[in-house]
């Protein structure tokens, strides 16, 4: 107690009434209006509470303070009077703030600010949407991934800021009349091969694929070491030469020199060199056969093996090289009588005739090309008179039926001696190497030495044996007719051919000629 009669124990936020009582300060309240014990407290009255009589008015908020309250304008509003706080509705001068005018960059890029009562909203430009985590920020809509599929399937969607494009895929182009970019773009595959837009190496052939192309090795070529086939950067090398090497077990300097020349020609070979290369190979072969040198000292069987190897290899090499020639007819002849006739065409539906000094060949063009082969069609005929030296005394192997028939009907069968080669050896080839069973036969007309009377004339081909050598055979070849110095043969396959005179004593009327042929 103090002497003036005022209680000293009044709780916080209260004042004494007298020596024994206290009262809460304005803005505070206690359980009873008069406080008589120090245990009671004065608590702040929340004037802003719902049931309070305080009214700040519109566009404002009531803020409770310790022992009092303030009225303030709501966010987005400001007092016209300039007073930040007020106490009742009559003092309220709050009005809407136009944030858009106050801060033109409020919606950042790609949005338009729209003022609202007490606030504002951002309206995004077409192609943009509000970012969920920042509703004031407009971000690009990716039309390409939004599942809208706005582009035609022949195009690919390219998103860009605020928009998108429908662009032709690489290797495609707009169809006639279509734009390239808008959402109505429609595209079609570009044929890079026929339009010349490809980058294929000259050793390859261009193949169009959907939206792209690939480069495949030319027929008879293989990918260079370590480079895959069928790529845009495929580079190939000619296989033609790599496989034509001397036959195993034959030791001949002359033959080695010939094959050295072949390998030299193959080393830096390019498709554009085909014509010169063909001529050089035939020149070398012509020289080899004109002067066989130590080949003539080899045993007969080995000579036949060499001949077989030369004929087989020559056919492959010429086939491979001739596919690189341009269209037209070629004729080459050489001092020792070797002769080449070649016709190269994009396939045509007619028969072709190749004429040489000692032989004529006639066949249908449609035999020449393997289906699906993109290259030109080639028909070739080589006459190789010099091959006769190496094929001297080569055996003739008849089919069992023909053999039997001849034995039965020719009483004067001369068993001694091999058949005599009457004609030049010729070799026929096509770009198509599958020539074992022609759909229509090939006809050869041979000019040859005179036939000895009463001797059997046979149209034969050289059959390459399993042992790498070979023999003359007649299977699939028939003699259509023969005169003293010419014979017509018809065969259902291609190989190397000749006319032989067999040692049979033929009667004046030959009852088995028809059977033989």
């Amino acid at each position: 107690q103090d002497s003036r009669g005022c209680a000293r124990w009044c709780p916080q936020d209260s004042s004494c009434v007298n020596a024994t009582a206290c009262r809460c300060n304005p803005g505070f309240s206690s359980f009873s209006e008069i406080i008589t014990t120090p245990m009671e407290t004065c608590d702040d009255i929340n004037e802003c509470a719902t049931l309070s009589k305080v009214s700040c008015g519109k566009f404002s908020d009531c803020w409770n303070t310790e022992g009092s309250y303030d009225c303030v304008c709501s966010p987005g509003y400001e007092p016209v009077s300039g007073a930040k706080t007020f106490k009742n509705e009559s003092e309220n001068t709050c009005q809407d703030v136009d944030e858009c005018q106050q801060n033109p960059r409020l919606c950042k890029s790609y949005g338009t600010c729209v003022n609202t009562l007490g606030s504002y909203t951002c309206q995004c430009l077409p192609g943009f949407k509000l970012k969920p985590e920042d509703p004031k920020l407009c971000t690009d809509v990716n039309e390409c991934t939004s599942g809208q599929n706005p582009c035609h399937s022949s195009t690919h969607c390219l998103n860009n800021v605020g928009s998108y494009q429908c662009r032709c895929r690489p290797g495609w182009q707009p169809i006639p009349g279509s734009p390239n970019g808008p959402n109505n773009t429609v595209c079609e595959d570009v044929d890079e091969c026929s339009s010349g837009q490809h980058q294929c190496d000259s050793s390859t052939v261009c193949f169009n694929t959907v939206g792209s192309y690939s480069c495949r090795c030319r027929p008879g070529w293989k990918p260079r070491h370590g480079i895959p086939n069928n790529q845009k950067d495929t580079v190939c090398e000619d296989m033609t030469f790599s496989t034509w090497t001397p036959p195993p077990g034959v030791h001949s300097q002359t033959l080695s020199r010939f094959f050295d020349k072949v390998q030299d020609l193959g080393r830096d070979y390019k498709p554009g060199l085909a014509n010169n290369t063909i001529q050089s190979i035939l020149q070398a072969l012509d020289e080899l056969l004109e002067a066989p040198g130590d080949l003539e000292t080899l045993p007969r069987l080995q000579q036949h093996c060499v001949a077989s190897h030369l004929l087989d290899g020559l056919e492959d090499v010429l086939r491979g090289l001739s596919k690189n020639l341009s269209n037209g007819l070629l004729n080459f002849s050489y001092p020792a009588g070797t002769e080449l006739s070649l016709e190269v065409q994009k396939q045509v539906d007619r028969s072709v005739t190749l004429r040489q000094n000692q032989a004529v060949m006639q066949l249908d063009w449609n035999q020449a090309q393997k289906s699906g082969d993109p290259g030109p069609s080639v028909v070739g005929l080589v006459s190789i008179p010099g091959m006769g030296k190496l094929l001297a005394e080569a055996p003739l192997v008849l089919e069992p039926e023909k053999q039997m028939l001849l034995h039965e009907t020719h009483q004067g069968l001369l068993q001694d001696g091999s058949p005599i080669l009457l004609s030049d050896v010729i070799s026929a080839f096509l770009s198509n190497n599958d020539t074992q069973n022609l759909s229509s036969p090939v006809t050869f007309t041979f000019s040859h030495r005179s036939v000895i009377p009463r001797q059997k004339v046979l149209c034969v081909f050289w059959e390459h044996g399993q042992n790498g050598c070979g023999h003359w055979a007649t299977t699939g070849c028939s003699t259509i007719g023969t005169r003293d110095t010419s014979t017509i043969c018809r065969c259902t396959h291609l190989s190397s051919f000749a006319v032989l005179m067999a040692h049979y004593d033929v009667q004046e009327e030959d009852p088995v000629l028809t059977v033989i042929t």
Partner: antibody
Framework: QVQLQQSGAEVAKPGASVKLSCKAS????????MQWIKQAPGQGLEWIGA????????RHTQKFKGKATLTADKSTSTAYMEVSSLRSEDTAVYYC???????????WGQGTTVTVSS | EIVLTQSPATLSLSPGERATLSCSAS?????MHWYQQKPGLAPRLLIY???KLASGIPDRFSGSGSGTDFTLTISRLEPEDFAVYYC?????????FGQGTKVEIK
């Protein structure tokens, strides 16, 4: 008739580069390799390399790899040789010649004289 | 590389005489060619593929040989034949020339 026309004489400073040209006419440019041959004053013939105009493939001697760059332009039937990092020993007459393995170098250009001098 | 050695380095002969020029290869060669060069001019092909006469070349020139030894023969020297002669091989890369044989008037 076959002709190989080479560009005119060049005088260059050490370290510089020169690009020589050889324009072919009278034959199919892609049917032969184009050879380049160097002949230093009073010396013999030295093969530099060759370019195949059909696909731009090249062959070089080891000595001229990185020194001589061979190219060909099919559209103008012209072969080019660029000689770089020139030194006095590059002073020579440079010939182009068309060539094929079996036929040798059957037609030659008239030669281009390159003089390297500071 | 294949080294070609020509001999002799110089051949002194009179017009009308026979000239025999040799070219020896360090390994076997399939395609050997011969060229003639006169001062200030480009070389010209004389013989290709060992023995074949190039276009426009008189038949007094002939070539022979095989393997590693090759010969160029001029049967009767004419005044215009005095020049430098080079052999050249095309059997392996790099292509190589012989160092040349000078045929001079005696």
């Amino acid at each position: 008739q076959v002709q190989l026309q080479q560009s005119g004489a060049e005088v260059a400073k050490p370290g510089a580069s020169v690009k020589l040209s050889c324009k072919a006419s009278g034959y199919t440019f892609t049917n032969y390799w184009m050879q380049w041959i160097k002949q230093a004053p009073g010396q013999g013939l030295e093969w530099i390399g060759a370019v195949y105009p059909g696909d731009g493939d090249t062959r070089h001697t080891q000595k001229f790899k990185g020194k001589a760059t061979l190219t060909a332009d099919k559209s103008t039937s012209t072969a080019y040789m660029e000689v770089s990092s020139l030194r006095s020993e590059d002073t020579a007459v440079y010939y182009c010649a068309r060539g094929f393995t079996a036929y040798g170098m059957d037609y030659w250009g008239q030669g281009t004289t390159v003089t390297v001098s500071s | 590389e294949i080294v070609l050695t020509q001999s002799p380095a110089t051949l002194s002969l009179s017009p009308g005489e026979r000239a025999t020029l040799s070219c020896s290869a360090s390994s076997s060669v399939s395609y050997m060619h011969w060229y003639q060069q006169k001062p200030g001019l480009a070389p010209r092909l004389l013989i290709y593929d060992t023995s074949k006469l190039a276009s426009g070349i008189p038949d007094r020139f002939s070539g022979s040989g095989s393997g590693t030894d090759f010969t160029l023969t001029i049967s009767r020297l004419e005044p215009e034949d005095f020049a430098v002669y080079y052999c050249q091989q095309w059997s392996s890369n790099p292509l190589t020339f012989g160092q040349g044989t000078k045929v001079e008037i005696k």
